[in-house]
């Protein structure tokens, strides 16, 4: 929802967290603001305190329940409001009717590990965290490998167009240090976006055997 120079953007992690960012030019830094969530079909409501992340933007996480509990469904709509204190009352600064499964951003994949490493290839696996039962197998992944002397931005993206929680990296250089990251995205949702990148996994390929062609 955008009001003039105000922007209010939220994402649902598909289980029990809605993360919101509110930005407004010229907003007072010392004003106390919060996000309030009212689902249309549920018995709970939730509030979180907006904390500054830059000069004109604030963020907070609505914790809806235990991390792996499914708190919203594909038919739910949540009214999200930014409320800021003005003297003794609260003023509504922004409002949106939020469809959780149209605005998904999952948690970064976790538990990255090297399953098998050779001189030229490496098999890596990972797990998804706090992902809804609704997705079944309807997820995709992007992966990238950091080579020596390059930046993450330069790393080519490898796309896995299915729920495949492993990858076999080929054509690697022997006895070389690499780093690997992966991110996940559900196929569902008009405004769904990629998860953050996972924590990097460092690994080293095996040295080439002496006397062998590399």
């Amino acid at each position: 929802a955008v009001n003039g120079t105000s922007q209010f953007t939220c994402f649902y992690n598909s289980r029990a967290n809605i993360s919101c960012v509110w930005s407004q030019d010229g907003a007072l830094q010392d004003t106390s603001c919060q996000v309030h969530a009212w689902p249309d079909r549920r018995r709970w409501n939730q509030t979180c305190e907006l904390l500054p992340v830059s000069q004109a933007s604030w963020a907070c996480n609505l914790i809806l329940g235990a991390p792996d509990s499914q708190k919203l469904t594909t038919v739910d709509i949540v009214t999200l409001r930014v409320l800021c204190r003005e003297g003794v009352r609260w003023r509504v600064m922004a409002i949106q009717d939020f469809k959780p499964f149209e605005n998904l951003r999952l948690m970064a994949p976790i538990s990255l590990q090297v399953v098998h490493v050779e001189t030229h290839r490496c098999n890596i696996s990972w797990e998804i965290s706090q992902a809804s039962h609704y997705f079944e197998r309807h997820l995709e992944f992007e992966a990238r490998t950091l080579s020596p002397g390059h930046t993450w931005e330069e790393a080519p993206l490898l796309t896995l167009k299915q729920k495949q929680e492993w990858i076999c990296l080929e054509t690697l250089t022997p006895d070389t240090q690499y780093e690997f990251q992966v991110r996940v995205k559900p196929l569902q949702g008009e405004f769904t976006t990629w998860s953050p990148w996972s924590q990097p996994l460092a690994f080293r390929t095996k040295p080439a055997a002496l006397g062998k062609d590399t």
């Epitope: 249309d40 509990s69 039962h133």
Partner: antibody, heavy 116, light 107 residues
């Protein structure tokens, strides 16, 4: 206290339409979904559709193939369910209910009999 | 559509007995499972919401448990006024669907 009061029993001929009303009181009508459920004799409960009075948004069970229309009159805090092209198998008790993490309050039910 | 299957279809128990009714969903519905009581005259009441939440005014002898596809309604000590038909219902997705019901009688 929350109350949902439905209109009285109806007898209709095949091919006709029926419109059942559900008057809500004891809560803010525009803030909760109203759902319609029916129960044919000796059968399980069957969800027909729902409406959010605050916006007029509706959802329908595809089984009813466009025969059902759910509306509200917010000024009267009343929801309506209209079922058209009636057939004998539509003979059932029709219930309205409020949705709030389950259907937490129900109307008393309206018996609709379809008979030639 | 998600199919809901209850068992048993009917049961007879004595006052004071512990009674268990089960409900199985044809696919994972997380915890979006509710239980209703329908008295012989047709009156419907919500007993349990979101698998285990006790609706206001419902006696504490009623409880619910389960997750995913398998769910249970338990009456810890059966009372004469519990004679009714009990229905499970999923609100995981539209169209919402109900079990076929379990008719409970007193011996």
């Amino acid at each position: 206290q929350v109350q949902l009061v439905q209109s009285g029993a109806e007898v209709k001929k095949p091919g006709a339409s029926v419109k059942v009303s559900c008057k809500a009181s004891g809560y803010t009508f525009t803030s909760h979904w109203i759902t319609w459920v029916r129960q044919a004799p000796g059968q399980r409960l069957e969800w027909m559709g729902d409406i959010y009075p605050g916006s007029g948004n509706t959802n329908y069970n595809e089984k009813f193939q466009g025969r059902v229309t759910i509306t509200v009159d917010t000024s009267a805090s009343t929801a309506y369910m209209e079922l058209s092209s009636l057939r004998s198998e539509d003979t059932a008790v029709y219930y309205c209910a409020r949705e709030r993490g389950g259907f937490d309050y129900w109307g008393q039910g309206t018996l609709v009999t379809v008979s030639s | 559509d998600i199919q809901m299957t209850q068992s048993p279809s009917s049961l007879s128990a004595s006052v004071g007995d512990r009674v268990t009714i089960t409900c199985r969903a044809s696919q994972d519905i997380s915890n979006f499972l509710n239980w209703y009581q329908q008295k012989p005259e047709g009156t419907l009441k919500l007993l349990i919401y979101y698998t285990s939440g006790l609706h206001s005014g419902v006696p504490s002898r009623f409880s619910g448990s389960g997750s995913g596809t398998d769910f249970t309604l338990t009456i810890s000590s059966l009372q004469p006024e519990d004679v009714a038909t009990y229905y499970c219902q999923q609100d995981n997705n539209h169209p919402y669907t109900f079990g076929q019901g379990t008719k409970l009688e007193i011996k």
